[in-house]
């Protein structure tokens, strides 16, 4: 008894084509490109039916269904627009991802994705992974005037990268991307094996304010060249946050220096240090303060710290110095780990040139300078850790 003649499903074809199909004869179904074999909602790798003794096929006919990539995945800090038509997610449909303007920019690709025959949204570069909305760095409400003035109260949005680190001593840091904090190794050394003990706060000006964005540390990475209690060479650390923070006008990462950044950090160029450290009155500041200070010639700074009680070689090539010869403008205890920032006049973005590291016992002392970790020397180290973790 022959089996019923197999009618190919739409967008599919039967092979082999025979005049009739009798016991043990078989046929397979092949779908056109952009269509897939489906039994119900599940993809089939192949389909072959065999004619049985009773004249029926041993399997029901599958469908050749147009490949449907399904609703595209949500893009963190971004959105998706249907280009082909509202809600169209089938083969060759086009969608466009974009990032939330002002605070995020798209990385990896241009955000245009096409539904391909394998059922996945695919970029023009062939990537199946989502694009990345990377936070825009170095945005500030403040514009630099280039003059020197100190002890100013910061206003909202002036230093949106500023991070307050508690859980030991009061220290500071600077937000990188949306889940890393750059700080000084000496500020977090005690917590290197207990990262969760660090209480990280951002998005606030007032040190004691209950209104802030809380972040917690997942891991602390201290530069392998830093030796605690043996000078401040390689005084740099990274804290990985256990969650990404939402970027806004009050929480924005600082940029890392470009290769060309040295041209904005020459002797007498102005950098800005901010923090809640000790003020001239000898107490931790309640409000975030900042000071604009010039970079000091490296030899001059080395000479200032060559005489006792400072051991020879205290100032290394991994450090930069800033301050006034006459004193009075400086960072101080409690500012440790904070960023010394500079304006890149080409990109019009602020970048971190230094990390508050050490200085004379008396902050702002004449003839002594604040010493900062020279961040540009550590770009490969920073990039390696961030890419690996």
């Amino acid at each position: 008894q022959p089996c019923p003649y197999p009618m190919a499903p739409p967008n599919g074809h039967v092979s082999p084509v025979q005049a009739k199909y009798i016991l043990k004869d078989s046929f397979s179904i092949f779908c056109e490109t952009g269509y897939e074999l489906l039994q119900g909602h599940l993809p089939l790798k192949s389909f072959t039916a065999v004619c049985q003794k009773d004249g029926s096929w041993d399997r029901p006919m599958p469908a050749c269904s147009i490949v449907d990539c399904g609703p595209p995945d949500d893009l963190p800090s971004g959105r998706v627009e249907y280009i082909t038509g509202p809600g169209v997610t089938t083969y060759k449909a086009v969608i466009q991802y974009s990032c939330e303007e002002t605070f995020y920019t798209m990385k990896v690709n241009d955000g245009k994705y096409v539904c391909e025959a394998d059922g996945f949204w695919t970029s023009s570069k062939g990537e199946k992974s989502l694009p990345v909305c990377e936070p825009v760095c170095g945005l500030s409400a403040r514009t630099t005037g280039g003059r020197i003035y100190g002890g100013q109260k910061a206003k909202p949005g002036d230093f949106p990268w500023q991070v307050l680190i508690l859980g030991g001593t009061t220290a500071a840091g600077a937000l990188l991307y949306d889940n890393w904090v750059l700080t000084a190794a000496h500020a977090v050394y005690e917590q290197k094996h207990d990262a969760s003990a660090l209480d990280i706060r951002m998005g606030t000006l007032k040190r004691l304010s209950p209104h802030y964005t809380q972040a917690w540390s997942e891991a602390v990475f201290i530069h392998e060249g830093y030796t605690h209690d043996a000078g401040f060479d390689n005084d740099i650390a990274l804290i990985k946050l256990n969650n990404k923070v939402v970027i806004n006008s009050n929480i924005t990462p600082i940029c890392l220096p470009r290769k060309e950044a040295e041209s904005f950090m020459r002797t007498d160029d102005i950098g800005t240090a901010s923090g809640w450290g000790l003020t001239q009155r000898g107490f931790l500041a309640r409000n975030l303060m900042y000071v604009d200070i010039p970079i000091v010639d490296h030899q001059k700074c080395t000479a200032a710290y060559e005489k006792p009680p400072y051991p020879r070689g205290s100032v290394t090539a991994n450090m930069l110095c800033a301050g006034l010869e006459s004193g009075g403008k400086d960072s101080c205890r409690g500012d440790s780990g904070g960023a010394l920032v500079f304006l890149d006049s080409e990109t019009e973005r602020w970048f971190v040139g230094g990390i508050v590291s050490w200085g004379s016992m008396n902050c702002g002392e004449a003839g002594q300078y604040g010493v900062y970790t020279k961040v540009i020397n550590y770009i490969p180290w920073i990039e390696n850790i961030i890419s690996d973790f």
Epitope: G40, L44, K45, G70, P71, T89
Partner: antibody, heavy 118, light 106 residues
């Protein structure tokens, strides 16, 4: 991004009915060829598929448990519910809900440990 | 319910290749899927439809499937690859998981 979260009792008594809820976000339960599966894993043992439901409401159950399982979805709440009747201590396991896409179970919830004990 | 059989354990030295097999009747006619599960964590899809890698899965993971056996291969195995691995296939519209393989990186 895509997330699934299981909720329900951590302890049930033998013969009782277990009701587990899976709340999803980042994808639609009503469109595309997406489905949600329930899978369990007894302590120290292998994964065991229980049931699934697709956007079209097509459902399928593990043959050996078919009479005890019911799966349903509430698209408006982005939820998939699994009920399992006549619970027994051997049903003690971590219960996962997960998304099915292109036949692969590509996103999993964190799982919820359900203990069956009197 | 059909059975997918895996070796209980596979040991491999760092940097070497680990191969995990999954056997089942005419498995090569179906798509095979592979999942990695680390202790205390939910499974993660590492290979779908025999040999495709989801985004975010390193290139050292690859898959093949023919005859009665699907194979997951981890080239240049790293310590972080130590985990349980499960194969899975669809039989009609029901999912079947393998018995699981514990991969130990020596």
């Amino acid at each position: 991004q895509v997330t699934l979260k299981e909720s329900g009792p951590v302890l049930v008594k033998p013969t009782e009915t277990l009701t587990l809820t899976c709340t999803v976000s980042g994808f639609s339960l009503s469109r595309g060829k997406m489905g949600v599966s329930w899978i369990r894993q007894p302590p120290g043992k292998a994964l065991e598929w229980l049931a699934h439901i697709f956007s079209s409401d097509e459902k399928s159950y593990r043959t050996s448990l078919k009479s005890r399982l019911t799966i349903s979805k509430d698209t408006s709440k982005n939820q998939v519910v699994l009920t399992m009747t006549n619970m027994d201590p051997v049903d003690t396991a971590t219960y996962y809900c997960a998304r099915i896409r292109a036949g692969g179970i590509d996103y999993w919830g964190q799982g919820t440990l359900v203990t069956v004990s009197s | 319910q059909p059975v997918l059989t895996q070796p209980p354990s596979v040991s491999v030295s760092p940097g070497q290749t680990a191969s995990i097999t999954c056997s089942g009747d005419k498995l090569g006619d179906k798509f095979a899927y592979w999942y990695q599960q680390k202790p205390g964590h939910s499974p993660v899809l590492v290979i779908y439809q025999d040999n495709k890698r989801p985004s975010g899965i390193p290139g050292r993971f690859s898959g093949s499937n023919s005859g009665n056996t699907a194979t997951l291969t981890i080239s240049g195995t790293q310590a972080m690859d130590e985990a349980d691995y499960y194969c899975q296939a669809w039989d009609s519209s029901t999912a079947v998981f393998g018995t699981g393989t514990k991969v130990t990186v020596l």
